[in-house]
């Protein structure tokens, strides 16, 4: 099971309205350039065999690669909405940094890496979906860890 | 091309079952769910619930629980919702819509199916 | 269950006109809403999602606006093709909810 009270983020980190939109807009910018809108990383696959406890620790592996391996790498882009957004990404990423699940967390792991697969496969066009996710990633983590 | 093909009108007696089928064709089936929304004459929408075709997992509104089941058979890429003791006000038309079931819309609907529930 | 409050519910307009229509959530929804186009003995079609993302192949003239709880549905200069009922719809919670519908006739 989670170390529950470790895997949580304060509501408030949803309820401000100004970075929230800046989230959605850089999704909105992102996503007009995905073609490719038969796949989805984050979704019912993501989630499946995974209980409701354990989603939070999920959606910060999840989180946490989207920062390394995406935002980081294609920083420059999307202005100005990139500049306002990787920041607080980056802080409720390390508000989740001591989130941790006791015992074995394979089956999280194994949807985590078909997400992985799944971007790095598309090359460039996965890292511009992931992007466009990024409504879907602020939704999961408020969902999962609030 | 992407689309969804339902069964043909039904005609019930009250308390009986209908069953309609959503054939779905033109895209990878088990990578969206399906939703069922109903329009009764001259009214609005109302969703009724939604099947993973992934997964098979299910959610009602409350107010078909336990009186529908959506089920799904990946072998043929058809959907299916069965509503039991039918009463005249749920003379309907019926359409299956494609979704993923998390923030999605429905961006394609089948044809509609009617079912009329008289005595 | 969110309620969904669509406004007007008929609108008579002309050929040319610049049409609104507004819809109000009960509660917050970010960006999850949708709008369809309904027209007599037809199936819903997608017009916009995610508040203010055109469907594909849906003509520019229609725009979609709005996030929380008060979105509108634009269209810039009616068209005849364009007279039907409009629904919005929220995804942002379950159940699915619609609003009442929006029925565009001519004036």
């Known amino acids: 099971a989670p170390i529950s009270s470790h895997c949580r983020l304060d509501k408030s980190n949803f309820q401000q309205p100004y970075i929230t939109n800046r989230t959605f807009m850089l999704a909105k910018e992102a996503s007009l350039a995905d073609n490719n809108t038969d796949v989805r990383l984050i979704g019912e696959k993501l989630f499946h065999g995974v209980s409701m406890s354990e989603r939070c620790y999920l959606m910060k592996q999840v989180l946490n690669f989207t920062l390394e391996e995406v935002l980081f790498p294609q920083s420059d882009r999307f202005q100005p909405y990139m500049q306002e957004v990787v920041p607080f990404l980056a802080r409720l990423s390390n508000r989740l940094s001591t989130c941790h699940i006791e015992g074995d967390d394979l089956h999280i792991q194994r949807n985590v890496q078909k997400l992985k697969d799944t971007v790095k496969k598309l090359g460039e066009s996965g890292e511009i979906k992931a992007i466009g996710e990024l409504d879907l990633l602020f939704m999961s983590l408020r969902n999962a860890c609030i | 091309q992407v689309q969804l093909v339902q069964s043909g009108a039904e005609v019930k007696k009250p308390g009986a079952s209908v069953k309609v089928s959503c054939k779905a064709s033109?895209?990878?089936?088990?990578?969206?769910?399906i939703s069922w929304v109903r329009q009764a004459p001259g009214q609005g929408l109302e969703w009724m619930g939604w099947?993973?075709?992934?997964?098979?997992?299910?959610n009602y509104a409350q107010k078909f629980q336990g009186r529908v089941t959506m089920t799904t058979d990946t072998s043929t890429s058809t959907a299916y919702m069965e509503l039991r003791s039918l009463r005249s006000d749920d003379t309907a038309v019926y359409y299956c819509?494609?979704?993923?079931?998390?923030?999605?819309?429905?961006?394609?609907w089948g044809q509609g199916t009617l079912v009329t529930v008289s005595s | 269950d969110i309620q969904m409050t669509q406004s007007p519910s008929t609108l008579s307009a002309s050929v040319g006109d610049r049409v609104t229509i507004t819809c109000r959530a009960s509660?917050?929804?970010?960006?999850?809403l949708a709008w369809y186009q309904q027209k007599p003995g037809k199936a819903p079609k997608l017009l916009i999602y995610?508040?203010?993302s055109l469907a594909s192949g849906v003509p520019s003239r229609f725009s979609g606006s709005g996030s929380g709880t008060e979105f509108t549905l634009t269209i810039s200069s009616l068209q005849p093709d364009d007279f039907a009922t409009y629904y919005c719809?929220?995804?942002?919670?379950?159940?699915?909810?619609f609003g009442g519908g929006t029925k565009v006739e001519i004036k």
């Open positions: 099947i993973s075709a992934y997964t098979g997992n299910t």
């Open positions: 995610k508040a203010s």
């Open positions: 033109g895209y990878t089936f088990t990578s969206y769910g």
């Open positions: 819509a494609r979704d993923r079931g998390y923030y999605d819309a429905f961006d394609i």
């Open positions: 509660e917050g929804i970010y960006h999850w």
């Open positions: 719809q929220q995804y942002s919670n379950y159940p699915l909810t």
